[in-house]
């Protein structure tokens, strides 16, 4: 019995769902009577589910698994794998036995897109040219482990005093930190770029350093200018500094974050003490380092309705404000692939293809191209769809008349993580059917 | 049964280049974190390298630029290049499989080490 | 990086005696990436206890991992034969990977 899964392992985001594609051809005549189908790890050999005496036996993995019931009796024994996890990733085998037997593997690859990364400025205040400074870059929940990359403005890769740490937390994610030191010139941009391996994500940030001295007079309060990008569901830190002169104390200082826009009240620090959050529970200063003028907010579990400008009043004696912008952002995920009609091809068909990648945010572009990478424009429709989270499912359509083979590529682009999710698909050979049947 | 075969130690001199091989069977190679890990003649153990299943490699620093990981996962075999070898290089070295998250990662699996010298 | 300091370097037991090794570090390490390993003379390390307290297949029963933080330890609560080994602890929560420099644990 041939059984048939993918050769190239199956990519799977942390927390979406992933589809095990397993098939094999009955014969007329097959009944779900005669079939014994059982998903297992191919390592340890751990029962996942199981089909047998014409039933479902049900998920033995955790509760997370899931056949497809009505697919069965066409040969279809692929496995549904629920809210996965970095502990899922690995080879699952697939035994399929009607009278005679036969069983293949899949591979699943666990995958999660890295934030855009953070940027600190060690010293950050009073940088005079030939000062070295620390520039720390920090991107958040990845996995697996990330490359990091650092450039100067013209692009020249900077390779010499660059530490760079991975830290796993309790899902099995990383966080990478990595530190470049350098040594100041009149002015000067710095870049990272954080790349997961599987995804092929790169998430980028830069700082330009402008060395001088900082002017006098009112509070000077300083924020990043880029905004702050943050994913769904993480938290956020939204910078803002000041100053202290000597002899500062946290009675002195009044503290107000509030939106820039509705100038609805976020949070505020008044009095000597922290007065707590007005912004849905969810915000926190960090007291231990007001004191030395760390202004910053701490945004947690952020929703896409958060995104916007936050305002940063401080007042000692005198008084100063500026304005921290947030970007939200949501990875989409690795686009599907749909063909109609599917079967029976043949050249001069004309074939709808459907590209579908879900709950990003901000909206996608879509981008599709042929073979050669000669970008594929007339013909294509897309939609972005808004859930209720505010989170878009994207789906293109492209219109092709078909050649004798041919290769079409959809890239579902993030415009602020500048993350590129890619599917494919080959129509070749005449007449076929996809996708393509044992 | 779990076996993890290095293979290509042996006595080379100062500024010399080494090829470390190690065949693995008993497990689905390609779906596993890869590393080597040595042991000095103190035995102190310190990881060298690691290698993701599609290929992406980490290395630690003492070595970076002068090892190369890699892995054929059609054959099951997992590589480290040496070159500019220096006598602090001289260890025991032992291909590892990296475990996944369910056991946290720990380093489940080690094989018999081959051993590499560099003296003039 | 993170420094792994296990004390002691070299310690000798009498067969049926309770045993207790420590493991230090530098900076604080996520009790679930903290792991112990094993080896004798001649042979390669063997995993032995993962995640702080978690025994790996067929490591007896009388052995007992805990700790949190920066200190971590592993116990054995009546010394046999078989235990005299070399123990290594181990951290996977912040590259680079780092090793203890092993305690030696003897018969007396």
């Known amino acids: 019995l041939e059984v048939q899964v993918p050769e190239d392992p199956v990519v799977a985001l942390v927390g979406t769902d992933a589809t095990l594609c397993c098939s094999f051809s009955p014969e007329p005549g097959f009944s779900l009577a005669q079939l014994n189908l059982i998903w297992q790890l191919t390592d340890t050999k751990q029962l996942v589910h199981s089909f047998a005496e014409g039933q479902d036996q049900g998920s033995a993995y955790a509760n997370r698994t899931a056949l497809f019931p009505d697919l069965l009796a066409q040969g279809n024994a692929s496995l549904r794998l629920q809210r996965v996890r970095v502990a899922d990733e690995g080879s699952f085998t697939c035994f399929v036995s009607i009278r005679d037997f036969g069983s293949a593997a899949v591979s699943l690859q666990v995958a999660a897109p890295y934030s855009k990364p953070s940027m600190t400025l060690e010293p950050n205040k009073d940088l005079r040219p030939g000062d070295t400074v620390t520039i720390t870059c920090s991107s958040y929940q990845g996995y697996p482990e990330a490359e990091v990359f650092w450039q100067d403005g013209q692009g020249v890769p900077l390779t010499g005093n660059v530490t760079t740490s991975q830290m796993a937390n309790e899902q099995g994610l990383f966080d990478v930190h990595s530190i470049l030191r350098v040594v100041l010139g009149a002015n000067g941009t710095y870049s990272c770029l954080v790349r997961n391996p599987v995804l092929q994500q790169d998430a980028h940030s830069s700082v330009t350093i402008t060395p001088q001295r900082s002017p006098t007079g009112a509070v000077e309060v300083q924020v990043p200018e880029d905004p702050v990008v943050a994913l769904v569901g993480t938290d956020a830190t939204l910078r803002c500094s000041f100053s202290p002169e000597p002899g500062f104390s946290l009675a002195q200082l009044n503290l107000i974050w509030q939106l820039t826009d509705t100038k609805q009240l976020v949070h505020s620090f008044t009095e000597g003490r922290d007065q707590g959050s007005a912004y849905a529970n969810r915000t926190a200063l960090f007291p231990d380092l007001l004191a030395q003028g760390n202004a910053s907010l701490r945004l947690q579990r952020v929703r896409v309705a958060d995104e916007g400008s936050f305002t940063c009043f401080v007042s000692i004696r005198d008084f100063g404000s500026a304005a921290v912008s947030l970007q939200v952002a949501a990875p989409y995920s690795k686009p599907s692939m749909t063909l109609e009609p599917n079967k029976d091809l043949r050249p001069g068909d004309t074939v709808t293809i459907t590209c579908s990648s879900y709950r990003g945010y901000p909206e996608a572009e879509v981008f599709w191209q042929d073979g050669q990478g000669v970008p594929l424009t007339g013909n294509v429709t897309t939609s972005q769809m808004a859930n209720e989270q505010g989170l878009f499912d994207v789906h293109s359509v492209l219109r092709v008349v078909l050649g004798a083979n041919g290769t079409y590529s959809c890239l579902v682009r993030n415009p602020v993580l500048q993350q590129d999710a890619h599917g494919s698909v080959t129509i070749t050979g005449q007449p076929m059917t996809f996708p393509p049947e044992a | 049964e779990v076996t993890l075969v290095e293979s290509g130690g042996g006595l080379v001199k100062p500024g010399g280049s080494l090829k470390l091989s190690c065949a693995a069977s008993?497990?689905?190679?390609?779906?596993?974190?890869m590393s080597w890990v040595r042991q000095t003649p103190e035995k102190r153990l310190e990881w060298v390298a690691s290698i993701l299943s599609g290929g992406t490699s980490f290395y630690a620093d003492n070595v970076k630029g002068r090892f190369t990981i890699s892995r054929e996962n059609a054959r099951n075999i997992l590589y480290l290049q040496m070159s500019s070898l220096k006598s602090e290089d001289t260890a025991m070295y032992y291909c590892?499989?990296?475990?996944?998250?369910?056991?946290?990662?720990?380093?489940?699996?080690w094989g018999q080490g081959t051993s590499v010298t560099v003296s003039s | 990086q993170i420094v792994l300091t296990q004390s002691p370097a070299n310690m000798s037991a009498s067969l049926g005696e309770r045993v207790t090794m420590t493991c230090a570090a530098s900076?604080?390490?996520?009790?679930?990436?903290l792991h112990w390993y094993q080896q004798k003379p001649g042979s390669s390390p063997k995993l032995w206890i993962y995640s702080t307290s978690n025994l790996a297949s067929g490591v007896p029963g009388r052995f007992n991992g805990s700790g949190s933080g920066t200190s971590y330890s592993l116990t054995i609560s009546s010394m046999e034969a078989e235990d005299a080994a070399t123990y290594y602890c181990h951290q996977y929560h912040r590259s680079p990977w780092t090793f203890g420099g092993g305690t030696k644990l003897e018969i007396k």
């Open positions: 008993g497990f689905t190679f390609s779906t596993y974190v």
């Open positions: 900076s604080s390490v996520s009790s679930s990436y």
């Open positions: 590892v499989r990296r475990y996944g998250h369910d056991r946290y990662y720990a380093m489940d699996y």
